[in-house]
Interface confidence: low
């Protein structure tokens, strides 16, 4: 079943079929006898009840308010009311671009890496039974694809695939022909899976500390998925029970790179932790990058130039 219209603010293009489906649909079936009403308010008009006689373009079916098609003057607020349930939507109908096969404000942007899997499938589940045929256009030129019911592109992306892809569904309703357009702006970007990993921040960091206190040394890097980030300290790692490597945190950027962060926690700082190197290293197939931290007693920090301190 088609999901309900949960978004409170909706923008649609004039001249296309459109529907609003309230989100207590299953409940409405259980209480058929309950009065269910749809209202519209816009500008000076306050809460005008809608029914099929309101306009030849409006149809009401169970949980759905349909527009055949939606027009500029349908802009406004819509309400569904049933017993003690109310749902509200704000509908903004925008002008169709008469000079293009799509309207720029109704474009979904997607970024695809070159050589990665790229797919466009033309589907419209709500109007599926009414759709006669569907065409897929690239930059407003029709693509000749085998399946004219649900045209699909499935391939490994190439730079030439960049462009605007428009799925246009043609359907009949009450003897009239309508179309619904969904456009994707596909940007193909360089395969960025192998950047040169870099540790962020200064290469040498003096950290002012107090004996007996705790400190957290944060090491951050921009790296590839398969790269590793690790801490090295002392003669053999793990010999000091007061030193703990925290779990590595990674977040992915939209371009498929990774920001990694790994914290070294030193508890109950002692003399043995001072003036020794705590090294953080990022390693990849292309080499390594290392940055160092040195713990310095707060009282001694006057001896060190200010610019070497971490913020």
């Amino acid at each position: 079943a088609e999901s309900c219209t949960s978004r409170p603010h909706i923008t649609v293009v004039e001249g296309e079929p459109f529907y609003l489906k309230h989100c207590s649909c299953s409940l409405a079936h259980e209480i058929e006898t309950t009065t269910k009403s749809w209202y519209k308010s816009s500008g000076s008009q306050e809460h005008v009840e809608l029914n099929p006689r309101s306009s030849s373009r409006i149809a009401l079916h169970d949980c759905v308010l349909e527009f055949w098609p939606v027009e500029l003057n349908d802009t406004g607020s819509y309400f569904f009311q049933m017993k003690n349930y109310t749902q509200k939507w704000k509908l903004n109908v925008i002008r169709r671009n008469k000079h293009s096969c799509f309207t720029e404000r109704q474009v979904t942007s997607k970024i695809v890496e070159v050589k990665k899997f790229f797919q466009i499938t033309c589907e419209n589940s709500y109007y599926q039974t009414l759709v006669n045929s569907t065409s897929l256009y690239k930059n407003c030129k029709k693509l000749l694809l085998e399946n004219n019911k649900n045209p699909t592109i499935k391939k490994n992306a190439e730079f030439e695939d960049q462009g605007y892809y428009s799925c246009v569904h043609f359907l009949h309703h009450n003897g009239k022909l309508f179309n619904i357009t969904k456009t994707f702006n596909i940007t193909i970007v360089e395969d960025r899976s192998n950047i040169v990993p870099v540790l962020l921040g200064p290469k040498l960091n003096h950290v002012a500390v107090e004996l007996g206190k705790n400190v957290r040394l944060n090491c951050s890097a921009l790296l590839n998925e398969e790269d590793v980030i690790y801490w090295m300290f002392g003669e053999e790692n793990g010999s000091d029970p007061n030193i703990h490597e925290e779990k590595e945190m990674r977040i992915m950027t939209p371009e498929g790179k990774w920001h990694a962060s790994k914290v070294l926690r030193i508890e109950n700082i002692g003399e043995s932790n001072l003036n020794v190197l705590y090294n953080c290293t990022v390693a990849s197939t292309g080499g390594t990058d290392t940055k160092s931290f040195i713990l310095v007693r707060k009282a001694d920090m006057a001896d060190i130039p200010g610019h070497v301190f971490t913020r």
């Epitope: 360089e190 192998n194 950047i195 962020l200 977040i251 992915m252 939209p254 920001h259």
Partner: antibody, heavy 118, light 112 residues
């Protein structure tokens, strides 16, 4: 310290090409993307494209595709931007800018003024 | 492309007073996977290249005075100079780096 030093001002005739250079120092040249941004006199900033100095891969703004070519010479840590079929509205200051990884631009060159005039 | 619109185009503020510049993007530049807004602010003085002030919408670049601050999320962003100094006279640009890179048209800040 990080420095991006660009080539000097150029005067070109319409239809000609111009090649601007950007020499990087103070960091690992192949570790950061290099972008080119231009600014027409009294106008705002316009992104033109980037080059990955490590692989030589490029990505150009749609507006400049077919007219712009970005290259690099890793042996001298220099990025180049060549713009062909120049028009008078290409008169602008052209900047190179370093990018830590498809993000914001943390260092900029001083700019190169390209004047296109018949 | 994502269109960035700044307001006002120019702003005259007395020394020591607050200056506020707004920037609106035509679509959200917030990326839910890492909770970041892909927006930066730059300062450009006459005859100089732009200088990075703020990135991730609110993170101040190292060395930038703390009178500069950035705020906002999604499509609406603000750069605030809490107490305008003579050296802050410049043109300020917002830039999105979510899908390619686009800049606002710039806001000129002058002393009243």
């Amino acid at each position: 310290q990080v420095q991006l030093v660009q080539s000097g001002a150029e005067v070109k005739k319409p239809g000609a090409s111009v090649k601007v250079s950007c020499k990087a120092s103070g960091y690992t040249f192949t570790g950061y993307y290099m972008h080119w941004v231009r600014q027409a006199p009294g106008q705002g900033l316009e992104w033109m494209g980037w080059i990955n100095p490590n692989s030589g891969g490029t990505n150009y703004a749609q507006k400049f595709q077919g007219r712009v070519t970005m290259t690099r010479d890793t042996s001298i840590s220099t990025a180049y931007m060549e713009l062909s079929r120049l028009r008078s509205d290409d008169t602008a200051v052209y900047y190179c800018a370093r990018d830590m990884g498809d993000l914001f631009f943390d260092y900029w060159g001083q700019g190169t003024l390209v004047t296109v005039s018949s | 492309d994502i269109v960035m619109t700044q307001s006002p185009d120019s702003l005259a503020v007395s020394l020591g007073e607050r200056a506020t510049i707004n920037c609106k993007s035509s679509q959200s530049v917030f990326y839910s996977s890492n909770n970041k807004n892909y927006l930066a602010w730059y300062q450009q003085k006459p005859g100089q290249p732009p200088k990075l002030l703020i990135y991730w919408a609110s993170t101040r670049e190292s060395g930038v005075p703390d009178r500069f601050s950035g705020s906002g999320s999604g499509t609406d962003f603000t750069l605030t100079i809490s107490s305008l100094q003579a050296e802050d006279v410049a043109v300020y640009y917002c830039q999105q780096y979510f899908i390619t890179w686009t800049f606002g048209q710039g806001t000129k800040v002058e002393i009243k």
